[in-house]
């Protein structure tokens, strides 16, 4: 049974040039994670392995981070960036949890920084 | 240039152990992901785990009970043990190079294959 | 586990045609798609990875594209050098999966 919840960022904005961290944060469950897969839409924007470390899709390489943690930094935002992002984990023997977050890109200086709330500080063994 | 080198014996018994070794030249195994996969007559292609330049494993469900992979850092090599083989392991078997920052799952070096068949 | 699916296991074609082999997911793996080609006697050669970007030293006439669920893999202009076996594979997640194959035969 499936007993895991994923904390997100929720929806957030961020001004256009600027950069913004995607977080999520899986609790209420013992499963190991085995991966993280950052996506937009049909896009693959970056896998966390456990094992193996961070992949960044060679679309993005240049302006996508690995991190905090298994978060995703997104940098150089444009107006284009606006949209829904989801941290799809891999888990063992639960299976996959996915978490939203929405993103808008804003033109002028109004853009709210972070998150609604603070996403605890997770700690990833091996 | 990243060289890989498959040996072992080619012929194994039903119920016997099968092991393997990878021998790796110009580059080390304490970087980058270690994988053994599997071409059976017919074409079908299995990818069966890998060793991670830390050391950890990770290997295809479909194989967990029977699969050991391991290494020797300072021989530069890497090994296979499959348990309990049965006929349905008959197969070429790879070892290959993984560059996961920069390819993902994708296998960039492949060894030559050696052919091993499970015949009692 | 994903099935890779390629519903042409033998594709017979001439030099100087374009010819395209296709691989269905059984379920969405966004970009994660790489294509091998396999000659015989040769262990399997990476042409392309992420679905569309090739590998170094892979001559231009071969493209990968799609994503989602479809994936196709083209050669634009066949050389009698391209028969091969050519198989598509999954890395969105383990266990990473390849699909049957696809046999380019040259006329």
């Known amino acids: 049974m499936m007993t895991g919840t994923i904390e997100t960022t929720g929806n957030i904005s961020a001004e256009k040039g600027g950069s913004i961290i995607l977080q999520c944060h899986l609790s209420s469950t013992t499963a190991q994670v085995t991966q993280v897969n950052w996506e937009q839409q049909d896009q693959l924007l970056a896998i966390c392995n456990a094992d193996l470390g961070w992949h960044i899709s060679p679309s993005f390489k240049d302006r996508v981070a690995p991190g905090p943690g298994l978060g995703l930094t997104l940098q150089s935002l444009t107006v284009n960036d606006t949209g829904e992002y989801f941290c799809i984990y891999h888990t063992y023997p639960d299976g996959t949890y996915t978490g939203r977050i929405f993103l808008e890109v804003l033109e002028s200086s109004v853009a709210e920084h972070g998150a609604r709330f603070q996403i605890p500080h997770h700690h990833h063994h091996h | 240039e990243v060289q890989l080198q498959e040996s072992g014996p080619g012929l194994a018994k039903p119920s016997q152990t099968l092991s393997l070794a990878c021998s790796v030249t110009?580059?080390?195994?304490?970087?980058?992901?270690w994988n053994w996969i599997r071409k059976f007559p017919g074409n079908k292609l299995e990818y069966m785990g890998y060793?991670?330049?830390?050391?950890?494993?990770y290997y295809n469900p479909s194989l967990k009970s029977r699969i050991s992979i391991t290494r020797d850092t300072s021989k530069n090599q890497f090994y296979l043990q499959l348990n309990s083989v049965t006929t349905e392991d008959t197969a070429t078997y790879y070892c290959a190079r993984l560059d996961f920052s920069n390819y993902g799952g994708a296998v960039d070096y492949w060894g030559q294959g050696t052919s091993v068949t499970v015949s009692s | 586990d994903i099935v890779m699916t390629q519903s042409h296991t033998f594709m017979s074609t001439s030099v100087g045609d374009r010819v395209s082999i296709t691989c269905k997911a059984s379920q969405n793996v966004r970009t994660a798609v790489a294509w091998y080609q396999q000659k015989p006697g040769q262990s399997p050669k990476l042409m392309i990875y992420s679905a569309s970007y090739r590998y170094t030293g892979v001559p231009d006439r071969f493209t990968g594209s799609g994503s989602g669920t479809d994936f196709t893999f083209t050669i634009s202009s066949v050389q009698a050098e391209d028969l091969a076996v050519y198989y598509c594979q999954q890395y969105y997640t383990t266990p990473w999966t390849f699909g049957g194959g696809a046999k380019l035969e040259i006329q």
């Open positions: 060793i991670s330049y830390s050391g950890n494993t």
């Open positions: 110009g580059y080390s195994i304490t970087s980058d992901s």
